[in-house]
C-alpha cells in the first residue's frame, strides 16, 4: 500500500506566440482545480480499467479576476497535494492523465458552471520511494508544471511497496541508514540509489546503480534527447563540418506513435498527433472512458464501440460543451417572441411576456384579430399588438356592438339640429345656413358661399 | 402540467413493424430529451432509447438494429418504430420526459400493451 | 452496460415500519447519477428520488437515498398504506441507461 502525490507547480500560458488569455476575466471570475487519473502502465490493463490505479480531485483554488490589459500570468493554485491512495503493489509503470478545470463563479442560475481548459496525459516508469520527478507538459497553449513521487506507507517498503518492514527492538546488525526487514531480521534494505549522475527528471532506476530513461531519451545518464543521437557515424576528423556521413533513423521512422497516431518531426524530436481519445507522447495513453465519470451536470456518457475508446457526452437541457461543463445562455437564442422577457431558471426556460401577449414563448396575441369578429359588419384591423375595429355606419365601440350615437359628438354646426337615422344622422339646419353639418351660410341675394371649386 | 398519451395498435403480427405515438400535451416538446421504455408483463423495465429535439438519438444496443425514434414537432409528438418483432416484444410501453438534471424520467405516459402474436 | 441489483426481492413490512431498499451496481455510477421509481399496479412508475439523495416534486420527505459509488438506499422512514408498490432503480451516468429489477414491497 501507498500513495501517489502529485503536487502542481504552475499553470499558465506556455512560451511562444499565441498565448492565451486569462480563462477569468472582470466580468466572470473564476478559479481552478484539478483531476489526476492513474492507470496501470501494460495498455492491456488499460484498456481493462481506467483509473484503475485511482483518481483525485483537488480543492479550489483561489478567486482569480482578470486585471484589464495584463498579460495572462500563471493561476492561483488550490494548496496542498493531489494524493491518489494505491492499495495493492506500485506498478512502477504508470500512465497519468492530468486535467485542469475552470469554475466559474459569476450570477449563474442554479450553481458555478464548469469548463475543462486542459488535459495532459503521459506514460512514465517511477520507483516508489524514490525522489519527486518534475515534469513539463503542454496542452494547446497552455503548460503545466508539476511533480509527482510514489510512496509506501509503513510498514510496506521497496520500490513496489510489496515488502514488509518493521523496526528492530534489538539493536540494529545494520549499517547507517538500513533497515531490518521482516520476515528476515538479518536482512537489511537500503534505500534505491541510481548511478551517480543519472538524470533525476528522465532517469530512474529499479535496481541500485542502475540509470534507465524515460521516453525520448537516451545516453549514460539519459541527458540526450534522442533526437540528437541519431548519427550512425559521424564524419572523421578531417572533416571541418559536423554532421552525419550516413544519416541515421529519423525520429518518425517506423512510426513510434500508437494507436493510429501520425509521426510529425520537431527540431529536437519527434510529435504525435494522436486519433481521439488518446494521448501521450507515444499516443500510448488510452483517454478518459466513461467509467470515469467525464459527464459533468448530469450528462449521459454515451461510449464508443469498445469499453476503452471515446465517450461522448450527451448534455441535459441548458448544458453543453464536451464535457457538459458549459451553461448554455439559453436566452441568447431569443426565445420570446413579440418582446417578452427571458428568464433562464436553470430548470427551465420562462418568457415574462407583454401586455396583449401570451403562451410559453409569448407567441399568441391575445389581441389579434385571428378567431376575433367585429358584430355588425365591422372589420378588424390589427396593429402592434391590438387589435381594433373599423365599425359600420351607426355602431360603434371594440367589437361595434354598441349602437352608436351618431348625434353625441354635436356634429351639426351653426345651431343645427341633429336627428339619428338608420343610417347616419340626418342634420336640420338654423335659418341662414345649409350643407350636410350646417357648415355653410346662405348669404342675402341667395348664393351659398360655398367654396370654389 | 406536462401529460404524455401514447397511441397505436394493440396487436402486432410476428416478423411486422410495432408503430406508437406519444402525444405531449401541456408543454412544448421543444428543449427536452424524449423517451421510450417498455415492461413485459410481471417483468421489470428495459429502456428503448430516446431522442432530443434537435434530432440526437441513442438507442439501447439490444435494441438498436431495429429501432428508429423520431419527433414532429409541429404535432407535438414523437414515435416508435420496432420493425422485425417477435413475441418477446410484447410489453407494456411507456413514453416518458426525460428530467432536466439528468437523464432519469420526470413525466411517464400511461401505457399501452402491446401484444405480438398471429 | 451497468448491471444493476437490487434487494431484498420482496420485503414484507407492517405499515409504520422502516422500508429499506438497497441498490447494488456492477461498477461505479459516476456522480451518483442514481433515480428510484415506484409503481403499482396498472400504474406507470413514478420518479421518487433522482442525483442518488434529491426529492422529485410532490415526493413526501418520508422517502430519502443515500449512496455512492456502487452501493444505494432507498429508506421509506414509516410506511403508509400508499406505499406498499415495486421500486425499482435506474442509472444514467454511463448509456444505456438500466433499471434493477425491482423490490416489492407487500404488506406482512
Known amino acids: 500500500a501507498g500513495v501517489f502525490e502529485l503536487q502542481i507547480h504552475s499553470f499558465g500560458p506556455g512560451p511562444g506566440p499565441g498565448a492565451p488569455r486569462s480563462p477569468c476575466s472582470a466580468r466572470l471570475p473564476c478559479r481552478l482545480f484539478f483531476r489526476v487519473c492513474l492507470k496501470p502502465g501494460l495498455s492491456e490493463e488499460a484498456a481493462e480499467s481506467p483509473c484503475a490505479l485511482g483518481a483525485a480531485l483537488s480543492a479550489r483554488g483561489p478567486v482569480y479576476t482578470e486585471q484589464p490589459g495584463a498579460p495572462a500570468p500563471d493561476l492561483p493554485l488550490p494548496d496542498g497535494l493531489l494524493q491518489v491512495p494505491f492499495r495493492d503493489a506500485w506498478p512502477g509503470t504508470f500512465s497519468f492523465i492530468i486535467e485542469t478545470w475552470r469554475e466559474e463563479l459569476g450570477d449563474q442560475i442554479g450553481g458555478p458552471a464548469w469548463s475543462l481548459l486542459a488535459r495532459v496525459a503521459g506514460r512514465r516508469r517511477l520507483a516508489a520511494g524514490g525522489p519527486w520527478a518534475r515534469d513539463i507538459q503542454r496542452a494547446g497553449a497552455w503548460e503545466l508544471r508539476f511533480s509527482y513521487r510514489a510512496r509506501c506507507e509503513p510498514p510496506a517498503v521497496g520500490t513496489a511497496c510489496t515488502r514488509l518492514c518493521r523496526p528492530r527492538s534489538a539493536p540494529s546488525r545494520c549499517g547507517p541508514g538500513l533497515r531490518p526487514c521482516a520476515p528476515l531480521e538479518d536482512e537489511c534494505e537500503a534505500p534505491l540509489v541510481c548511478r551517480a549522475g543519472c538524470s533525476p527528471e528522465h532517469g530512474f532506476c529499479e535496481q541500485p546503480g542502475e540509470c534507465r530513461c524515460l521516453e525520448g531519451w537516451t545516453g549514460p545518464l539519459c541527458t540526450v534527447p534522442v533526437s540528437t543521437s541519431s548519427c550512425l557515424s559521424p564524419r572523421g576528423p578531417s572533416s571541418a563540418t559536423t554532421g552525419c556521413l550516413v544519416p541515421g533513423p529519423g525520429p518518425c521512422d517506423g512510426n513510434p506513435c500508437a494507436n493510429g497516431g501520425s509521426c510529425s518531426e520537431t527540431p529536437r524530436s519527434f510529435e504525435c498527433t494522436c486519433p481521439r481519445g488518446f494521448y501521450g507522447l507515444r499516443c500510448e495513453v488510452s483517454g478518459v472512458t466513461c467509467a470515469d465519470g467525464p459527464c459533468f451536470n448530469g450528462g449521459l456518457c454515451v461510449g464508443g464501440a469498445d469499453p476503452d475508446s471515446a465517450y461522448i457526452c450527451h448534455c441535459p437541457p441548458g448544458f453543453q460543451g464536451s464535457n457538459c461543463e458549459k451553461r448554455v445562455d439559453r436566452c441568447s437564442l431569443q426565445p420570446c417572441r413579440n418582446g417578452g422577457l427571458c428568464l433562464d431558471l436553470g430548470h427551465a426556460l420562462r418568457c415574462r411576456c407583454r401586455a396583449g401577449f401570451a403562451g410559453p414563448r409569448c407567441e399568441h396575441d391575445l389581441d389579434d384579430c385571428a378567431g376575433r369578429a367585429c358584430a355588425n359588419g365591422g372589420t378588424c384591423v390589427e396593429g402592434g399588438g391590438a387589435h381594433r375595429c373599423s365599425c359600420a355606419l351607426g355602431f360603434g365601440g371594440r367589437d361595434c356592438r354598441e349602437r352608436a350615437d351618431p348625434c353625441a359628438a354635436r356634429p351639426c354646426a351653426h345651431g343645427g339640429r341633429c336627428y339619428a337615422h338608420f343610417s347616419g344622422l340626418v342634420c336640420a339646419c338654423a335659418p341662414g345656413y345649409m350643407g350636410a353639418r350646417c357648415e355653410f351660410p346662405v348669404h342675402p341675394d341667395g348664393a351659398s358661399a360655398l367654396p370654389a371649386a | 402540467q406536462v401529460q404524455l398519451q401514447e397511441s397505436g395498435p394493440g396487436l402486432v403480427k410476428p416478423s411486422e413493424t410495432l408503430s406508437l405515438t406519444c402525444t405531449v400535451s401541456?408543454?412544448?416538446?421543444?428543449?427536452?430529451?424524449w423517451s421510450w421504455i417498455r415492461q413485459p408483463p410481471g417483468k421489470g423495465l428495459e429502456w428503448i432509447g430516446y431522442?432530443?429535439?434537435?434530432?440526437?438519438?441513442n438507442y439501447n444496443p439490444s435494441l438498436k438494429s431495429r429501432v428508429t425514434i423520431s419527433l414532429d414537432t409541429s404535432k407535438n409528438q414523437f414515435s416508435l418504430k420496432l420493425s422485425s418483432v417477435t413475441a418477446a416484444d410484447t410489453a407494456v410501453y411507456y413514453c416518458?420526459?426525460?428530467?432536466?438534471?439528468?437523464?432519469?424520467?420526470?413525466?411517464w405516459g400511461q401505457g399501452t400493451l402491446v401484444t405480438v402474436s398471429s | 452496460e451497468i448491471v444493476l441489483t437490487q434487494s431484498p426481492g420482496t420485503l414484507s413490512l407492517s405499515p409504520g415500519e422502516r422500508a429499506t431498499l438497497s441498490c447494488r451496481a456492477s461498477q461505479s455510477v459516476s456522480s451518483s447519477y442514481l433515480a428510484w421509481y415506484q409503481q403499482k399496479p396498472g400504474q406507470a412508475p413514478r420518479l421518487l428520488i433522482y442525483?442518488?439523495?434529491s426529492r422529485a416534486t410532490g415526493i413526501p420527505d418520508r422517502f430519502s437515498g443515500s449512496g455512492s459509488g456502487t452501493d444505494f438506499t432507498l429508506t421509506i422512514s414509516r410506511l403508509e398504506p400508499e406505499d406498499f408498490a415495486v421500486y425499482y432503480c435506474q442509472q444514467y451516468g454511463t448509456s444505456p441507461l438500466t433499471f434493477g429489477g425491482g423490490t416489492k414491497v407487500e404488506i406482512k
Open positions: 416518458a420526459r426525460i428530467g432536466v438534471a439528468g437523464f432519469y424520467f420526470d413525466y
Open positions: 431522442i432530443f429535439y434537435s434530432g440526437i438519438t
Open positions: 442525483g442518488a439523495s
Open positions: 401541456g408543454g412544448s416538446i421543444n428543449s427536452y430529451y
